[in-house]
Interface confidence: low
Amino acid sequence: MMTGTIETTGNISAEKGGSIILQCHLSSTTAQVTQVNWEQQDQLLAICNADLGWHISPSFKDRVAPGPGLGLTLQSLTVNDTGEYFCIYHTYPDGTYTGRIFLEVLESSVAEHGARFQIP
């Protein structure tokens, strides 16, 4: 039975041109994490494999950095980066856990004068 839960940074916002950390945490389970996939809508961004380490999809190598931990850092943000991001934890023996984060990338002026800009 899958007893674990995924905690995420939830809905976050960041400034255009800046960077943001996407973070998920799997708790309430003793299952072994074998791999974590990070996806944006239907596109694979990165994999963190327990044996082989990190690999960033070639299409995103210019703006995606691994870590901290099992998280993912997005750099040089554009408005087009707004949307849903998923952390997919592959575990044994539980199976797959998925967490969702919604990122809104704001124009600099909006971020500077609004309360929604956060650094997690």
Epitope: Q35, L44, I47, N49, D51, L52, H55, S57, P58, S59, K61, D62, R63, Q75, S76
Partner: antibody, heavy 115, light 107 residues
């Protein structure tokens, strides 16, 4: 529309040199990794080298078969990719393709190394 | 370097039939696998990336599967325009490497 056009192929004697070019358009050249891949007549594809994008310092990687003889470079102001080939051998005869990250390829240019 | 092995150099299949092309990596490549189609005199065309993701404009009769070291390209309802050579490529580890190709013919 993404467009890649290779040029510069031809007949070269063993030991000679040649520079291939790949003119690109339809995308922000600085932002993408670029590669060269070759294919000898009737044979399989062979990945040769890549040059990373601006964010990754335009660093380069090579396969063992061409390391030290071939040099990949890019002119970011003109959006052109180059492959400088030195000490050419008969086994370098092939169609040479430039490719952009994301699966875009040119139509290729042919190199023949023969005396 | 990671070696990519396509066990079948040639496959002959009936029109409308189904074909499976296999590719095995010498080490784990974590789904960092692409499939290309190449017709004589043309540049390769990317069909599938990430082992399973169909590229835009590629007919749905093409599909990719696999994990770890073993990957498969499947074509259902084979059409005459599918006659080509198919290559797998790993892009998990530099140097990126291609399989030797599988030439598909109509029976």
């Amino acid at each position: 529309e993404v467009n890649l056009v290779e040029s510069g192929g031809g007949l070269v004697q063993p030991g000679g040199s040649l520079r291939l070019s790949c003119a690109t358009s339809g995308f922000t050249f600085n932002d993408y990794y670029m590669s060269w891949v070759r294919q000898p007549p009737g044979k399989a594809l062979e990945w040769l080298c890549l040059i990373r994008n601006k964010a990754n310092g335009y660093t380069t990687e090579y396969s063992a078969s061409v390391k030290g003889r071939f040099t990949i470079s890019r002119d970011n102001s003109q959006s052109i990719l180059y492959l400088q080939m030195n000490t050419l051998r008969a086994e370098d005869s092939a169609t040479y393709y430039c490719a952009r990250d994301g699966g875009y390829w040119g139509q290729g240019t042919t190199l023949t190394v023969s005396s | 370097d990671i070696q990519m092995t396509q066990s079948s150099s040639y496959l002959s299949v009936s029109l409308g039939g189904r074909v499976t092309i296999t590719c095995r990596a010498s080490d784990h490549i974590n789904n960092w696998l692409a499939w290309y189609q190449q017709k004589p005199g043309n540049a390769p065309r990317l069909l599938i990336s990430g082992a399973t993701s169909l590229e835009t404009g590629v007919p749905s009769r093409f599909s990719g599967s696999g994990s770890g070291k073993d990957y498969t390209l499947s074509i259902t309802s084979l059409q005459t325009e599918d006659v080509a050579t198919y290559y797998c490529q790993q892009y998990w580890s530099i140097p990126f490497t291609f399989g030797s190709g599988t030439k598909l013919e109509i029976k």
